[in-house]
């Protein structure tokens, strides 16, 4: 009988303790927000906000410019000065709550916790391949704003998410802010609003549309806005909030809110509950039917998917899918199953479910006792009636009022619990060739790059490495610049290639040559590496 090589166990064919050093930038303080810009003429930039400062970096993460955004009331505050001679409000540090690009101008918009949550607009000025910020414009007109009606009060100190959409000759800011009674009383930023940036950059147009948590619920009902994005005809917000206005406020769940990206109105505001579960292949005795619920969204990202995952999700390749990392509760502490699970929600399916929910509410025969919901935003009512009314009047449409869809969208963990003890804190999904890759940051400062695929009982790693020695959590927001992703951890920004940091963690030639084509791995004497690392022979075809 022929002698055969002993088979190397899969886990032994790789070493996740291999050190990779990726380019980084030390921001000088905890990174609060980060966004990237890629112009159509090869110019690009990374914008990094820390308390009281905004850094502009080149694509090589070298500093190009730095701007003082606080403290408010300090003569050195460069953004504050754009609002003219002060004082404009109580002195205090500026924590950046919003950092977004307005692609139509193009410009960077930053909004902070100070000065009533006002924003500043910085036109982008390309210089070669770098980008500079022009002098900021103060998006605040004092005579237009009052504590009870403040179009220019955008950011909440409790957190704000913004997505900018170009419509016509203006940029519309889709804004979602967490509120409590104190924040609502002082220049209330509203819960959800759509604000039109004025052409003269003096602020936002008055008379904007908005929804806000009703005063009686502000103390007990808090909404955390986790993520926002624009795709197709809609803007979406993802929230974590109490499952009920009346029950235990600590019983949380996740919702998707959908707003029209083509009409700056809130009549077609819709919410849908997202249900993510861990359903082990072999169910333990006493485990809940349908799997263990993971009701709290931690991070999310939407992306078009590659062919293989598309087939598994029964959708077409390239269709947009919302990916979310869910945990069992706010603390994300250990439960029976894994710490983190990942669920995939195809956008077209989400839209279909929402549209079906509208039909159920508005098309006769309406199921008796079907509630319009959203009682924290509007007066309770039953379908098809408008909020607070007993019946529809002839000139109103059931469809022109906000609605919570009566069914939820349920999915199970794509990774079948294989993330185990890992606590995922950041997520970005890319399509490489026909492969869909989840790039995840973790609570202990690591990056995991894993193929998103359902049908396996092990994880297909592109990489799993530590960003540095600090072990600080990777922050929620990830940005892409060219073929790199930017992750923030502590006071550092790290630049990670989307195709992985290298190949040295593959220990055997067989494993090396089975790596994905996009990684560019080959066998190099006695190690796995990319061609640029190999001065001698580099082999992608066969093992010695």
């Amino acid at each position: 009988e022929d002698w055969q090589c002993p088979r190397t166990p899969y886990a032994a064919s790789r070493d996740f303790d291999v050190k990779y050093v990726v380019p980084s930038f030390s921001a000088g303080g905890l990174v609060q927000a980060m966004v990237t810009y890629e112009g159509d003429r090869n110019e690009s930039a990374v914008f990094v906000a820390i308390r009281n400062r905004l850094h502009v970096l080149g694509p090589d993460l070298k500093s190009v410019q730095s701007l003082a955004t606080g403290p408010a009331g300090d003569p050195g505050c460069q953004t504050c000065a754009a609002c003219g001679p002060g004082p404009h409000g109580p002195p205090g540090d500026t924590d950046t709550k919003v950092l977004v690009l307005d692609p139509a101008l193009p410009a960077l918009v930053s909004c902070g916790s100070s000065l009533q949550g006002r924003c500043f607009l910085h036109d982008l000025e390309p210089q070669g391949t770098a980008v500079h910020l022009a002098a900021p414009a103060c998006l605040f007109s004092a005579h237009h704003n009052r504590p009870d009606d403040c179009p220019d009060c955008v950011a909440s100190p409790l957190g704000t998410r913004v997505t900018v959409v170009e419509q016509g000759q203006a940029s519309y800011f889709y804004v979602a802010s967490s509120l409590d009674a104190a924040v609502a009383a002082s220049f209330s930023p509203r819960s959800v609003s759509i604000r039109r940036l004025k052409a003269d950059a003096s602020g936002f147009a008055p008379g904007f549309v908005a929804l806000s948590v009703l005063p009686k619920h502000l103390v007990s009902y808090s909404i955390e806005y986790v993520h926002s994005f624009h795709t197709g005809a809609f803007v979406y917000f993802l929230t974590v909030q109490p499952a009920s206005v009346t029950d235990d406020p600590s019983a949380l769940h996740t919702r998707l809110a959908r707003l029209s990206a083509t009409e700056p109105e809130l009549g077609d505001y819709r919410e849908l509950v997202l249900d993510c579960r861990f359903a082990p292949k072999r169910r333990r005795r006493g485990a809940p039917e349908g799997g263990q619920p993971y009701p709290v969204l931690r991070v999310a990202h939407s992306a078009p998917v590659g062919a293989q995952l598309a087939t598994e999700l029964s959708i077409a390749e390239g269709q947009e899918v919302l990916f979310g990392v869910f945990v069992t509760g706010k603390d994300g502490g250990p439960g029976v199953g894994p710490n983190s699970v990942v669920c995939a929600f195809p956008i077209d399916l989400l839209d279909t479910l929402i549209d079906e929910g509208v039909e159920r509410c508005c098309e006769s025969p309406v199921h008796p006792g079907l509630r319009r919901g959203l009682d924290f935003f509007q007066s309770p009512s039953f379908c098809p009636n408008p909020p607070g009314l007993e019946a529809l009047s002839p000139n109103t449409s059931c469809r022109h009022f906000p609605l919570l869809v009566s069914s939820s969208f349920s999915r199970v963990d794509l990774f079948n619990g294989l993330l185990g003890p890992v606590q995922v804190t950041a997520l970005y999904v890319t399509r490489l060739d026909n492969v869909t890759v989840a790039h995840m940051g973790t609570m202990d400062g690591r990056i995991l790059q894993v193929e998103l695929v359902r049908s396996l009982n092990y994880l297909l790693y592109v990489s799993n490495f530590s960003l540095g020695d600090s072990g600080q959590p990777v922050q929620r927001d990830v940005s892409r610049l060219g073929d790199h992703l930017l992750f923030a951890s502590g006071d550092q920004v790290f630049q990670v290639p989307i195709q992985g940091p290298g190949c040295r963690h593959f220990l055997t030639c067989g494993r090396c040559l089975r790596a994905w084509h996009f990684m560019g791995c080959g066998w190099c004497g006695n190690m796995c590496g990319q061609q640029k690392e190999c001065p001698g022979s580099w082999q992608q075809d066969h093992c010695p």
Partner: antibody, heavy 121, light 107 residues
Framework: QIQLQQSGPELVKPGTSVKISCKAS????????MNWVRQKPGQGLEWIGR????????RYNEKFRDKAILTVDTSSSTAYMQLSSLTSEDTAVYFC??????????????WGQGTSVTVSS | DIQMTQSPASQSASLGESVTITCLAS??????LAWYQQKPGKSPQLLIY???SLADGVPSRFSASGSGTKFSFKIDSLQSEDFVSYYC?????????FGGGTKLEIK
Amino acid sequence: QIQLQQSGPELVKPGTSVKISCKASDYTLTDFYMNWVRQKPGQGLEWIGRIYPGTDKTRYNEKFRDKAILTVDTSSSTAYMQLSSLTSEDTAVYFCARSAYYGNYVAMDYWGQGTSVTVSS
Amino acid sequence: DIQMTQSPASQSASLGESVTITCLASQTIGTWLAWYQQKPGKSPQLLIYAATSLADGVPSRFSASGSGTKFSFKIDSLQSEDFVSYYCQQLYNTPWTFGGGTKLEIK
């Protein structure tokens, strides 16, 4: 009534530049965007870009970014478009047009009569 | 860029008849659509804004419908002055783009 009066026809040589004007009357120039549109002989309409006279902020169609420069002189209520490095491909009628809000929506509601630019050696 | 596909490129009709022109957007634009009329040697004139709303002074025989990606424009009871060119335009995202135009001719 509101009018946009454009400068007269131009016959120019290849490689040169031309600056055409559009004078607004009976409304405040700085309150509305001014757009420029090209129409080649026997063809359709192409949007070149727009300028907001209140701030001089411009937005160009990428196709025309290296061709057109939009400016305004608010003291004379006049908008200008300079076309550079002219070739026979730039032979066209150029229109200025105001865009305005109608409720939430926008439309180009007043147009100049057009300026014919012919590029020929 | 958003492509606007207008059809037909030309159409023959008789006085008093109705005609319909369609415009398809390559992506959803809500109701950010305008229709213009252009007479030979003249500048375009606004007829319809917000996909369905008639501009001031435009006769009621002109009408339009649609939202999202599919739009149509109708002229009832054609009169001699209507036999000119018509363009749709999306104003949702820059660059604002026009359809290729439709030339109406008398049969």
